[in-house]
């Protein structure tokens, strides 16, 4: 940048110096020097002179024509060709920056992390508007109709000390720039319904040497939340496949879930929990990996065809991952949900 | 009720500096986010800067670079420091609440006049 250049003359931006990417831009020089009478007026854009669409205007003036200006930013500075002088003579310089007003935000989340301390707020942005573009974080009370805001730039932490007079707030996103102002649409929170539970960990995992191998994993997390409904995914390493089972957990000791799956085999977990009723999950717990002991019967035991856990899980279902090489990142795609029966002898292979 | 009372405006040469007050009340100062504002003559009301109850700024892109915000929550009051001041900041300067727009509340304000 060049804020604080010495000029000897001005030059000056039309419609401004931060416009609309794509708009035509007119920028005009106007020297002041003494003891020159210029023979020629010279523009630069980062540092090139510039050969085409110049305009001397008069003795002292010249304008370079930009046509559907598209870079986000640019250096402009114009210079002199003064008589006996060897070298041209700077005259000013100006930064420019093209860009787009900001979309609407869209998607707003808020959150509160258990034991944090924070309410957290996130939402899309949406397109790049390359230019210097802030958030203002409206939280109104809908009990004492108070108004705090705070400024962001793509995501908002407040403390709940903060948000003491009342539990029901209106939550709004102010996107706003020097081309525009955009609002986002208003979420209606309750302080009570927006908690993400401690999170949860996968602590170990061992799988039995019965004749029908069991694998026992074990589960635990710091929450004082009573009611806390959880899945566990899990697939071997090398399928694309989750099985999701469901539990309702109860954190005061350490959970146990148990599954038959097929021996010899890497498989991964990953557990992640919401308070029973809400929306708001935990992300993923780190993948936990586990070998499963080989073979020791005959019978190729079917992970689907045998008892299911002795807790209250009652669904599983199979999503496909995007990329088994990055379990922490792999979406729902879709979901193909059966429920589990105990098994009574009849071994049903489910598909 | 609230009050705001803005203070520190003059008569100062261009390229010189100045430093604005505003002194609040009859609400709970640190938790609110702030703004300056402006009405220069014959023109309508600019929006200046904004400070929220956390100190983060937000500045018009004509001051970006000249003026900063900054509010003392132990005095309940809020600041402008208006340096290599120009021709056209001559204005008068008000205080409000909240971060962003250009409306104030309807308190006296202080002239800043900037001329050689």
């Known amino acids: 940048g060049i804020t604080s250049i010495n000029c000897s003359g001005d030059m000056w931006v039309e419609p401004g110096e931060i416009f609309q990417m794509g708009m035509n831009v007119s920028i005009y020089c106007q020297e002041a020097l003494k003891h020159c009478r210029p023979r020629n007026l010279y523009f630069y854009k980062n540092g090139f002179k510039e050969e085409f669409d110049i305009t001397r205007i008069n003795r002292t003036t010249a304008r370079i024509w930009y046509k559907g200006f598209s870079e986000p930013h640019a250096y402009m500075h114009c210079t002199a060709e003064c008589p006996g002088h060897f070298q041209e003579t700077l005259i000013c310089g100006k930064d420019i920056s093209s860009g787009h007003p900001p979309d609407a935000p869209s998607n707003l989340t808020c959150v509160i992390y258990e034991y944090s301390g924070n309410m957290t707020c996130t939402w899309n942005t949406g397109k790049p508007t390359y230019i210097d573009t802030k958030y203002i974080v409206h939280v109104k009370s809908l009990e004492t109709e108070e108004e705090q805001q705070y400024l962001a730039s793509s995501y908002v932490k407040i403390s709940t000390d903060s948000l003491q007079g009342s539990r029901k707030y209106l939550v709004w996103v102010q996107a706003v720039n020097s081309l525009g102002m955009e609002n986002s649409q208003q979420l209606h929170v309750h302080l009570d319904d927006i908690v993400i539970p401690s999170a949860s960990i996968i602590s170990r995992a061992e799988t039995t040497n019965d004749t029908v191998p069991k694998t026992i994993v074990y589960w635990k997390s710091k929450t004082m939340i009573e009611k806390v409904f959880c899945e566990m995914r899990y697939k071997t390493t090398t399928n694309q496949t989750w099985s999701v089972k469901e539990f309702d957990a109860n954190f005061t000791y350490v959970q146990q879930s148990e599954f038959y799956l097929e021996p010899d085999s890497k498989y991964v977990f990953q557990v992640r929990c919401q308070e029973t009723g809400k929306r708001n999950w935990q992300p993923w717990s780190s993948p936990f990996v586990h070998q499963t002991s080989q073979e020791t019967g005959k019978r190729n035991w079917q992970p689907w065809s045998s008892p299911f856990v002795h807790q209250t899980s009652q669904t599983v279902s199979q999503v496909t991952a995007k990329s088994s090489h990055e379990p922490q990142k792999m979406e729902m795609l879709s979901a193909t949900i059966f429920r589990g029966h105990p098994a009574s002898g009849n071994h049903q292979d489910i598909g | 009720q609230v009050q705001l009372q803005e203070s520190g405006g003059g008569l100062v040469q261009p390229g010189g500096s100045l430093r604005l007050s505003c002194a609040a009340s009859?609400?709970?100062?640190?938790?609110?986010?702030m703004r300056w504002v402006r009405q220069a003559p014959g023109k309508g009301l600019e929006w200046v800067s904004g400070?929220?109850?956390?100190?983060?700024?937000i500045y018009a892109d004509s001051v970006k670079g000249r003026f900063t915000i900054s509010k003392d929550n132990a005095k309940n009051t809020l600041y402008l420091q208006l340096n290599s001041l120009k021709s056209e900041d001559t204005a008068m300067y008000y205080c409000?609440?909240?971060?962003?727009?250009?409306?104030?509340?309807g308190s006296q304000g202080t002239q800043v006049t900037v001329s050689s």
């Open positions: 409000a609440q909240g971060v962003y727009g250009d409306t104030y509340s």
């Open positions: 009859g609400f709970t100062f640190r938790l609110t986010a």
């Open positions: 400070i929220d109850s956390r100190g983060s700024t």
